[in-house]
């Protein structure tokens, strides 16, 4: 069971300092951006991290949304990352959800975050290069020191 708590506005970067944004095709991508680029591309660079109370404490449960014309929420349905046009619900009556991730700091590095899927144990949000694009994907990972599954989250509130 997940119950919605407060939300915060954040900029999410990979460890190469590329900024996560949602492109015109609703795809989550990473790109090099200056601070002014980041501001100019808002709201596509501003993510709403919705925190949830978890009936089984397993880290900070979050849903990640973005508000462009409408609110879209990050989902890992069938292990595929996409933004679905939906508001994060107030309550989720299950211990797993395709929109809930556990945000945890990397041990010894409070500023580096990992996001593990609540639906798929051992699967993490990751940045992966595909041709010329740096994509946000869901990846099964058993080397947890891999930088591709580490992110920084800068609060914009």
């Amino acid at each position: 069971y997940f119950g919605k708590l407060e939300s915060k506005l954040s900029i999410i970067r990979n460890l190469n300092d590329q900024v996560l944004f949602i492109d015109q095709g609703n795809r989550p991508l990473f790109e090099d951006m200056t601070d002014s680029d980041c501001r100019d591309n808002a709201p596509r660079t501003i993510f709403i991290i919705n925190m949830y109370k978890d009936s089984q404490p397993r880290g900070m449960a979050v849903a990640i949304s973005v508000k462009c014309e409408k609110i879209s929420t990050l989902s890992c349905e069938n292990r595929i990352i996409s933004f679905k046009e939906m508001n994060p619900p107030d309550n989720i009556k299950d211990t797993k959800s395709d929109i809930i991730f556990f945000q945890r700091s990397v041990p010894g590095h409070d500023n580096k975050m990992q996001f593990e899927s609540s639906s798929y144990e051992g699967y993490f949000l990751a940045c992966e290069k595909e041709r010329d694009l740096y994509k946000l994907i869901l990846k099964k990972k058993d080397e947890l020191g891999d930088r591709s599954i580490m992110f920084t989250v800068q609060n914009e509130d």
Epitope: P57, G108, E116, G122, D142, E143, G145, D146
Partner: antibody
Framework: QVQLVQSGAEVKKPGASVKVSCKVS????????FHWVRQAPGKGLEWMGR????????KYAERFKDRVTMTEDTSTDTAYMELSSLRSEDTAVYYC???????????????????WGQGTLVTVSS | DIQMTQSPSSVSASVGDRVTITCLAS??????LTWYQQKPGKAPKLLIY???KLQDGVPSRFSGSGSGTDYTLTISSLQPEDFATYYC?????????FGQGTKLEIK
């Protein structure tokens, strides 16, 4: 309690291949991997590689990648490690081990080699 | 590849002694470090994971500490059954690498 039971000792000639099996008995959760570790007589532990039973993907140590093949038969819960072009330096005890997520009090994951097979001695001698 | 430098390679101690074994990683391994005990002719046995978390059933005289690149295994008061070889393992990145081992012998 998970137990790993390995095949028996083998004596091989240089240039031959050996295939070691590792059978899981007992209840094991999903989301584990099989790793193989070897130990030459009087020496330390050396990681050889791993296989993911979910999709059969493998990761091999660079020094073995041209000679080792790790496979898994989900229907029998058995993992296999085949090493080819054997030489005398491959004389060692070969261990299989499971690689599973353990969690701390905040749910943070750590992968751990927890269950180990009893080891299989492979002797390479002409 | 991440190198794990374990020291000392051997140590002689008496029952009741406090013993410390260290492992130095060639880069940050984010506490993805486990410690194993191995006795002759036996498979390794997990003692500590996540640098400082005691595996169930392991006596509390064993403890682990460290972060970044420096890690320590401490046995607070040696018991006769603790004489064995100890290995650290980094699980941060492939290829996984073990320390060279520390043989703990009776003085």
């Amino acid at each position: 309690q998970v137990q790993l039971v390995q095949s028996g000792a083998e004596v091989k000639k240089p240039g031959a291949s050996v295939k070691v099996s590792c059978k899981v008995s007992g209840e094991i959760s999903t989301g584990y991997y099989f790793h193989w570790v070897r130990q030459a007589p009087g020496k330390g532990l050396e990681w050889m590689g791993r296989i993911d039973p979910e999709d059969d993907s493998t990761k091999y140590a660079e020094r073995f990648k041209d000679r080792v093949t790790m496979t898994e038969d989900t229907s029998t819960d058995t993992a296999y490690m085949e090493l080819s072009s054997l030489r005398s330096e491959d004389t060692a005890v070969y261990y299989c081990t499971t690689w599973r997520i353990y969690r701390d009090s905040s749910g943070r994951p750590f992968y751990v080699m927890d269950a180990w097979g009893q080891g299989t001695l492979v002797t390479v001698s002409s | 590849d991440i190198q794990m430098t374990q020291s000392p390679s051997s140590v002689s101690a008496s029952v009741g002694d406090r013993v410390t074994i260290t492992c130095l990683a060639s880069e940050d391994i984010y506490t993805y470090l486990t410690w194993y005990q191995q006795k002759p002719g036996k498979a390794p046995k997990l003692l500590i994971y996540g640098a400082n978390k005691l595996q169930d059933g392991v006596p509390s005289r064993f403890s682990g500490s460290g972060s970044g690149t420096d890690y320590t295994l401490t046995i607070s008061s040696l018991q006769p059954e603790d004489f064995a070889t100890y290995y650290c393992l980094q699980g941060s990145k492939f290829p996984l690498t073990f320390g060279q081992g520390t043989k703990l012998e009776i003085k």
